[in-house]
Structure formats: C-alpha cells, structure tokens
C-alpha cells in the first residue's frame, strides 16, 4: 500500500479532496474524502491542506518520490508521493521503498545477492497518435536498471540511500550525489523548516542515525533563528 515512513498509517499519494463529510457504507454520500495526503497523517481532513510540490525525488523524504498525480501525459504539478512497496508497479528506483528497487516495472527486494551501486537509466520513447506511449505503460516513461554486486562505499556516486553501504546515506555533493556517513550523536545536522528544502543544498548532510533526531542544541535556544545550531540528539 502507500504507507510512509513518517507514520505507518501515512499516505501521501494525492492532494486532498475538496469535500467535507465522509461518505461511508450506509450513507447516501458517494464520496471518499479525507484520503491521499502528502506528508503526515494518512487520514488528515484539513480541506485547505496543500501537498508539498517538488521537482525531483531528492526533494522528498526517504520514503517518497516526486511525481505528478496524473495519468502521465498531462502536466500536473509534481508532488511528493509515498513510496511503492515490494511487488508493486514502478517506473524508477526512487519510487520503491527503501530496501527495494525497480526491476522490469516492479519493486523487488534489494537482497544481498543483488545490491546496486551505480544505476544506468534508459529512457525509451515512442509516440502514438496524440500521446507518447512507452514500453507497456501508456503515456509514461520507463527506465531499466543495470545491476551491480556491491553497495556504494563512502564517496561513491549514488541515486538514493539504498545504493549506499550500511551507515551511509546518499546526499548531494556539489551537483552530484555521493554516499556520506549517517550522522552520529552530537554531530551537527540540518533541520529543514519546510520539508524538501534540502533540495537547494550544495553540500547536503545525512540524516541522524537510528534513535537520534535533529534538534536545537540546548544552549542555543536563545540564539536568533538564523544562527540556531541543530545536532543529533537522543529521542
């Protein structure tokens, strides 16, 4: 299903419906509002909630990818969508949840015998009458992947964190992305005011390691907003 890492019950597939009252079995209202929200809780019912727009997968969370909630040939606004679980359809690696990758249009597990290092993306296009059609997916773009047997070490080029060895994440470095160490307790981290703002960083830091969260350093509470120092701290 479309669950996200932010909340085991979170769904982020589509913008919110415009409606209010829930349509449910037994009611005459044929509507299903309160579904498919980017970010946060799966069943938010805030009518004016705005999905987070994005331009590329890297601007979204680790369990998200960036795409337009459209049929493919239409130019909708791209938003962060929840990753696809194993055995579900995909068109590129970033669509699959961590620990999986896209193979032959299906998210499959990145088992120990098939770790990915570098990734070759092949985009094939052919055009139909009024829309482009591609490799079994109408009006959509597909990609194929080349498999490698080792996970990226520190400094290796990567596409997403699952391409990197344990203890590393995939983060931007200049205009490419490389495997960098996951942050440890006490290390400086970047706290983004708006989800996805890390897309603008030239030198992107990894996230904090397990059991840690990026919070304002206690002795910096009095500092101005612009100079607040965030570090990885125990929950």
């Amino acid at each position: 299903t479309l669950n996200s890492v932010l909340n085991s019950n979170a769904i982020k597939n589509l913008p919110p419906p415009l409606g209010g009252a829930a349509g449910h079995p037994g009611s005459a209202v044929s509507a299903a509002p309160g579904i498919l929200y980017p970010g946060g809780n799966k069943y938010q019912t805030i009518d004016n909630y705005q999905p987070y727009p994005c331009a590329e997968d890297e601007e979204c969370g680790t369990d998200e990818y960036c795409a337009s909630p459209t049929r493919g040939g239409d130019a909708g606004v791209q938003i962060c969508l929840a990753c696809r679980k194993r055995r579900k359809r995909c068109m590129r690696h970033a669509m699959c949840c961590p620990g999986n990758y896209c193979k032959n249009g299906i998210c499959v597990s990145s088992d120990q015998n098939h770790f990915r290092g570098e990734i070759e993306e092949t985009i094939t296009e052919s055009f139909g009458n009024d829309h482009s059609t591609l490799d079994g997916y109408s009006r959509r773009t597909t990609l194929s992947s080349k498999m490698y047997h080792t996970k990226g070490q520190e400094g290796s080029v990567c596409l997403r964190s699952s391409d990197c060895a344990s203890g590393l994440c995939c983060a931007r470095h200049f205009w490419s992305k490389i495997c960098k160490p996951v942050l440890k307790e006490g290390q400086v981290c970047t706290k983004h005011r708006r989800k996805g703002s890390h897309g603008l960083e030239i030198f992107q830091r990894c996230y904090c390691g397990e059991g840690l969260s990026c919070r304002i350093q206690k002795d910096h509470h009095q500092a101005s907003n612009s100079s607040r120092l965030h570090t990885c701290q125990r929950h």
Epitope: P15, P17, V77, Y137, R139
Partner: antibody
Amino acid sequence: QLQLQESGPGLVKPSETLSLTCTVSGGSISSSNYYWGWIRQPPGKGLEWIGTIYYSGSTYYTPSLKSRVTISVDTSKNQFSLKLSSVTAADTAVYYCARERAIAVAAIVFFDYWGQGTLVTVSS
Amino acid sequence: SYVLTQPPSVSVAPGQTARITCGGNNIGSESVHWYQQKPGQAPVLVVYDDSDRPSGIPERFSGSNSGNTATLTISRVEAGDEADYYCQVWDSSNDHVVFGGGTKLTVL
C-alpha cells in the same frame, strides 16, 4: 463539499446521440490533480468505465466505445459532458459522473466522488 | 484487455466475516480498489490501493492483494453491509479502467 450532478434526457431514440452533462460544485474542475470520468451501469449489471477527461482536454476512452464516445470539458461552467453516438438498446443504463484520482507512474487510478447517476433509456 | 473475476454472490451470517475475492492475472502487482453499491445508490469507495481505507469507512473493511487474488474482507458483518461490491484496477498497458463483474453480499 464536492458534489457532482448528472443532467440530460432520460429517453433517447435508437441511432441518435445520447448527451449528458455533469456539473461540479464545491470545487474547481480545473484542478491539475483531478480527472473527471463517466461510468455506466446497465440495469441489473455491473459497472463499465466509459472515459475520462482532464481539465486541459486530454481524454481517455474505453476501447469498446471509443469510436462512439466524445467527452468534453467546459471549465468556465465547471462542467464536463458525455456524447455517445448511434445508440442502441444496449446503451440503456444508469450513467454516473465521478471524480478520478490518478498516479499513472504507480498504476493507481480510482474514483472518490460520484454523482447519484441518471437513468438513460434508449427506446423508440 | 485485463479481466477481473468476482464470484457472483457471497452469503454470510451477521457477526461473521465475509471475504469477497477478485481474481486477475498477477493482480498482486496491481493496485486494487473496492466499491460498495447499495440498491438505487451510487458506488462508494471503501478500500483503495489494496488495503487503505478512506476516512469514514469502518475498520471492519480491509483489503489484501497477493498473487492472482485480491480480497475484500468485512469482519463482524452487519445487515447494513448487504450490497454489491466491485473491485477495480487500472490497466496500464491499455490505459483504461477495469471493473470486476461485482459480487452481491447477502447477510443471512
């Protein structure tokens, strides 16, 4: 709350064109994140998707009806319409308009808001 | 064209669990959606993307999808659950929406 309402003649003669309009209220038909579709249900039978339109005018039709179907949109009136030509008794059905949500890259397409439907009978 | 196969009818006693199946070639890789339709009413979405429920849909409604069969499960069935249930997928190869033939749930 978003509401969809079908309107049009309840009786159409064979070989003529069936014309229905769906008026959307409580939300804009021009949203880039939604599609608008037509589904029909012959009496006592199952649901059959007819086609879908995007506010930009992109259309998607079921293959079996493609040669006879035209779906159009009028964003200024917040309406979309269905035309089905050369109708026969087999086209007698309850016609529903609905809002469609789609993420083609993930092969997800479904309908979350429906009109109450309008019965169209094809008879001379 | 992708075909979805549903049993025409399923009967269950109140308080019991009803399971409505939807068969399709390798349907486990597809995202399956379920609608409930009561007589004289429009369909209502009860489960989307295999197992997710819209708000307002009771937790008694759940879905699963694996291999060649998707299943809508209704636990603690009530008289008000009596309705027709339709599964639906999107046939990406042909770019069109496909509905199953529908299953009539009868509460004994």
